[in-house]
Amino acid sequence: MMTGTIETTGNISAKKGGSVILQCHLSSTMAQVTQVNWEQHDHSLLAIRNAELGWHIYPAFKDRVAPGPGLGLTLQSLTMNDTGEYFCTYHTYPDGTYRGRIFLEVLESSVAEHSARFQIP
């Protein structure tokens, strides 16, 4: 039975050219996290964090995705095209798969504030 919940940074905004932390947190379960996959809006792969092997950053993002903090990702040099949904998929044992969603809005405005609040989607 899956008892856990995924908490995410929810809806966040950040400045064009800046960086943002994409973070998910699995709580309320003792399940072991074996792997976390990070995907972009079109379900294309950003990165994999395997418990045994560490990080695999998808080649197209190597120059602007930094692993961490923790199981999260830091997306740098943001462009307007980065606006959209991001998904964290937690593969766990014995529970199975948990999935969280984050919506990132990249703003042109120089006064854009980076809002990053933890919430359950």
């Epitope: 792997q35 996959n37 792969l45 994999i48 395997n50 045994e52 092997l53 560490g54 990080w55 695999h56 950053i57 080649p59 197209a60 190597k62 593969h91």
Partner: antibody, heavy 118, light 107 residues
């Protein structure tokens, strides 16, 4: 002991297709990418594409799109590559190699020789 | 595509010598380079990953160096069993690309 066991040599007719296999032994199949590489004398090595059995992510070299199709069966820890519309240019040795992050293509299979001839 | 150039197609050396094989990338690939050895009739064997890290079980006479666009595989105290082809791979970006190879001949 980590092994990638590839299927045997193939002699095939032009215009037909061929499907070769790569069985992973000695490690967790779903943790690593499986890369496919073509080696032809005088042409060196060419990367065809890779597949991640732990999420079914697949990437192809543009040059091999429409030529190669990569699949994987996690129940048997086996990756497959099908080559279609074969010509003499497809005659080569095809290798599978596992990879992940920094460990790009660290272990290779013994290769499958494909000869296209009428 | 990133082009990996190994300008020396053949290199001749003697047992006990030191030899350096080079590989040049057409653009910055940081340290995402692997060096391989392939003996006749065999599949490639990884020697060095991330430009300078020896793979498990590789003798310490094999050393890798470089970053960015210029990479070197150095074999010190060459042994007769080192007769082989050596080639580099970049895995910084798709499509992954290989150097053309350098055949090491023992005098």
């Amino acid at each position: 002991q980590i092994q990638l066991q590839q299927s045997g040599a193939e002699l095939v007719r032009p215009g037909t297709s061929v499907k070769m296999s790569c069985k992973a032994v000695g490690y967790t199949f779903t943790n690593y990418w499986i890369n496919w590489v073509k080696q032809r004398p005088g042409h060196g090595f060419e990367w065809i594409g890779d597949i991640y059995p732990g999420g079914y992510y697949i990437n192809y070299n543009e040059k091999f799109k429409g030529k190669a199709t990569l699949t994987a069966d996690t129940s048997s820890s086996t990756a497959y590559m099908q080559l279609s519309s074969l010509t003499s240019e497809d005659s080569a040795i095809y290798y599978c190699a596992r990879g992940y992050g920094s460990y790009a293509m660290d272990y290779w299979g013994q290769g499958t020789s494909v000869t296209v001839s009428s | 595509d990133i082009v990996m150039t190994q300008s020396q197609k053949f290199m001749s050396t003697s047992v006990g010598d030191r030899v350096s094989i080079t590989c040049k990338a057409s653009q910055n690939v940081r340290t995402d380079v692997v060096w391989y050895q392939q003996k006749p009739g065999q599949s490639p064997k990884a020697l060095i990953f991330l430009a300078s890290n020896r793979h498990t079980g590789v003798p310490d006479r094999f050393t890798g160096s470089g970053s960015g666009t210029d990479f070197t595989l150095t074999i010190s105290n060459v042994q007769s069993e080192d007769l082989a082809d050596y080639f580099c791979l970049q895995h910084w970006n798709y499509p992954y690309t290989f150097g053309g190879g350098t055949k090491l001949e023992i005098k």
